[in-house]
Interface confidence: low
């Protein structure tokens, strides 16, 4: 009986501490529980901001091409350069100079080259209005970009394109030969033949930046 | 000995259950050590991706007022119009316009009014030679917006300031009383005084638009 | 004051080319156009053409277009008019004045075109 | 080119008496015209410029009126130095021409 009261209370002692165990892995099974559930959300919340991040990277990227493309536009329009260099006229898609000083054909040709420009050329009746209007305040000659060898020869512009016959008549030295050849300048609005040597005004022309008008 | 057999029995069983129960509190334990672990992972990527979204945020935030910026250079670029309109010459801070009608000096003003500018007026010895420069190939007179009522009276721009006395000498009529008031023309380089009521050619001269040059 | 002297009278063959000068004092030479006039004996005022000789443009009448030449020394002052393939009806006295209205004038110089 | 014609082209006339000389354009010249007296073997000599302002130093007996095309030029009281011939010029637009002059003789 002895052996049998150590038993028993043996007994007692597992049964207690199996209770104890099984109230233990209850705790433990609950605590398990909520730690996956916790886990469960964690794995959310990263699933959430790796998504957030993910479309932030993208409209990051998109944000940083809009940027380069603006910085881009901004780059070919800030320095937006004028039409025309100053003292220059701007009419349609050219600039006009009129020369304040006064040199042969060839002399007046360099002058415009040097200014990035050519010698006047009338492509259209437009044109020769626009010029005719703005010497009108002139009584002097301007030379153009017209010249000829000699008479039997056809007017040429500096380009090497022929003159529109329909344009303008050429009076004055028409069938006159030069050493130097014969060169076209306008005068009070109509156009004249003489001789390249001689010195008159001029008027240089090139083409009008309007890229960012 | 038949209960001591069945207790040591029990004993055995409970000692059993106890050690599995040992068992599965040790693998728990671990599980949860190895949960926790993961847990800790988990909230550590979950601080690196919310800092990253947040560096991310700002980083955007920057973009878009960067972009914003851009957006409001390139309006105010953009459409950066010409110094000055077609057929107006551009120099220094002014556009000038030389008219290609014949009109009194009251007209002319109206005229220069009427495309939103005045008549020529000289501020600096600067101003009065580019004017020299590109009216040398006429002959004829330009108004300017110089005028005086009579000999008595100072010579007044129309903005109501006087003439700086050193900028040049005005010839011609000066000491002449007209019922229409003496204005002053420039030809050839040189100002005269001359009855209003006459015809001449004028210079405007407006504010060129310089914002975006 | 004000001065223009020109170059003394000339006789020449018809063809020939005749070149009168006009030297002025008194004033900026380049400020003012410098024009040319002509009167046939007993005959009115004709106008040949001008130089502004700060530029050296000039203007001519298409009269005298290929044949008129108007050029300027402006370290001297002096503005030239030469007429080439002289005719008799050429005949004239020639006249530099300065400026519009021309205020000043030179005395002439007369020109006689004979064979 | 504008055409300018003078009249007369002579006028006989007496020291104190009152002379007007005339001269039409082709068209209208906006006062830009001016009148020269010649004396025989001179050069001419500036009277009137832009149709009626008087050049310095000349007499103020010499004036000048007109617009548009028609222009006068009105001597108020001869004097014997004024027997010449004079000329009216348009300089509004080149060839600046002259009118073909009209002598004034003493009576």
């Known amino acids: 009986s002895q052996v049998s009261n150590l038993l028993k209370q043996q007994q007692t002692n597992l049964t207690h501490q199996k209770n104890k165990l099984e109230g233990q892995i209850s705790a433990r099974q609950q605590a398990e529980e909520a730690s996956q559930e916790s886990q469960n959300e964690l794995k959310e919340m990263i699933e959430t901001l790796a998504w957030k991040l993910n479309e932030k990277s993208k409209e990051q990227m998109e944000l940083h091409h809009q940027n380069l493309n603006l910085q881009e536009t901004l780059k070919r329009v800030a320095n937006c350069s004028a039409p025309c260099p100053q003292d220059w006229i701007w009419h349609e898609e050219n600039c006009y100079l009129f020369s304040t000083g006064s040199f042969n054909w060839e002399k007046s040709q360099e002058k415009c080259l040097s200014l990035d420009a050519k010698l006047l050329k009338i492509n259209s009746t437009a044109d020769l209005d626009f010029i005719q209007q703005a010497i009108s305040y002139s009584s002097f000659p301007f030379w153009m970009g017209l010249s000829r060898r000699n008479p039997s020869y056809p007017w040429l512009w500096e380009d090497g394109s022929p003159l529109m016959p329909h344009l303008f008549r050429i009076r004055g030295a028409v069938s006159q030969t030069y050493p130097s050849g014969t060169c076209a300048y306008i005068q009070r609005g109509a156009v004249y033949a003489e001789n390249c040597i001689l010195a008159a005004f001029s008027i240089c022309q090139k083409k009008a930046n309007l890229r960012a008008q | 000995s038949q209960v001591s057999n069945l207790l040591k029995q029990q004993q055995t069983n409970l000692t059993h259950q106890k050690n599995k129960l040992e068992g599965q509190i040790s693998a728990r334990q671990q599980a949860e050590e190895a949960s926790q672990e993961s847990q800790n992972e988990l909230k550590e990527m979950i601080e690196t991706l919310a800092w990253k979204l947040n560096e991310k945020s700002k980083e955007q935030m920057e973009l878009h007022h960067q972009n914003l910026n851009l957006q409001e250079t390139l309006k105010r670029v953009a459409n950066c119009s010409a110094p000055c309109p077609q057929d107006w010459i551009w120099h220094e801070e002014n556009c000038y316009l030389f008219s290609t009608g014949s009109f009194n000096w009251e007209k002319s003003q109206e005229k220069c009014l009427s495309l939103d500018a005045k008549l020529l007026k000289i501020n600096s010895t600067a101003d009065l030679d580019f004017i020299q420069q590109a009216i040398s190939y006429s002959s004829f007179p330009f108004w300017m917006g110089l005028s005086r009522r009579n000999p008595s009276y100072p010579w007044l721009w129309e903005d109501g300031s006087p003439l700086m006395p050193h900028l040049f000498r005005i010839r011609g009529a000066v000491s002449q009383t007209y019922p229409s008031g003496t204005c002053a023309y420039i030809q050839r380089g040189a100002v005269y005084a001359e009855n209003c009521i006459l015809a001449a050619f004028s210079i405007c001269q407006k504010k060129a638009n310089l914002r975006a040059q | 004051q004000v001065q223009l002297v020109q170059s003394g009278a000339e006789v020449k063959k018809p063809g020939a080319s005749v070149k009168v000068s006009c030297k002025a004092s008194g004033y900026t030479f380049t400020d003012y156009e410098v024009h040319w006039v002509r009167q046939a004996p007993g005959q009115g005022l004709e106008w040949m053409g001008a130089?502004?000789?700060?530029?050296?443009?000039?203007a001519y009448v298409q009269k005298f277009q290929g044949r008129v030449t108007m050029t300027r020394d402006t370290s001297t002052s002096t503005a030239y008019m030469e007429l080439s393939s002289l005719r008799s009806d050429d005949t004239a006295v020639y006249y530099c004045a300065r400026w519009l209205p021309m205020d000043y004038w030179g005395q002439g110089t007369l020109v006689t075109v004979s064979s | 080119d504008i055409q300018m014609t003078q009249s007369p082209s002579s006028v006989s006339a007496s020291v104190g008496d009152r002379v007007t000389i005339t001269c039409r354009a082709s068209?209208?010249?906006?006062?830009?015209l001016v009148w020269y007296q010649q004396k025989p073997g001179k050069a001419p000599k500036l009277l009137i410029y832009?149709?009626?302002s008087l050049q310095s130093g000349v007499p103020s007996r010499f004036s000048g009126s007109g617009s548009g095309a028609d222009y006068t030029l009105t001597i108020s009281s001869l004097q014997p130095e004024d027997f010449a011939t004079y000329y009216c010029?348009?300089?509004?637009?080149?060839?600046?021409?002259f009118g073909q002059g009209t002598k004034l003789e003493i009576k």
């Open positions: 068209q209208g010249i906006n006062n830009w």
């Open positions: 130089i502004h000789p700060g530029s050296g443009g000039a």
């Open positions: 010029q348009q300089y509004l637009i080149t060839p600046y021409t």
């Open positions: 832009a149709a009626s």
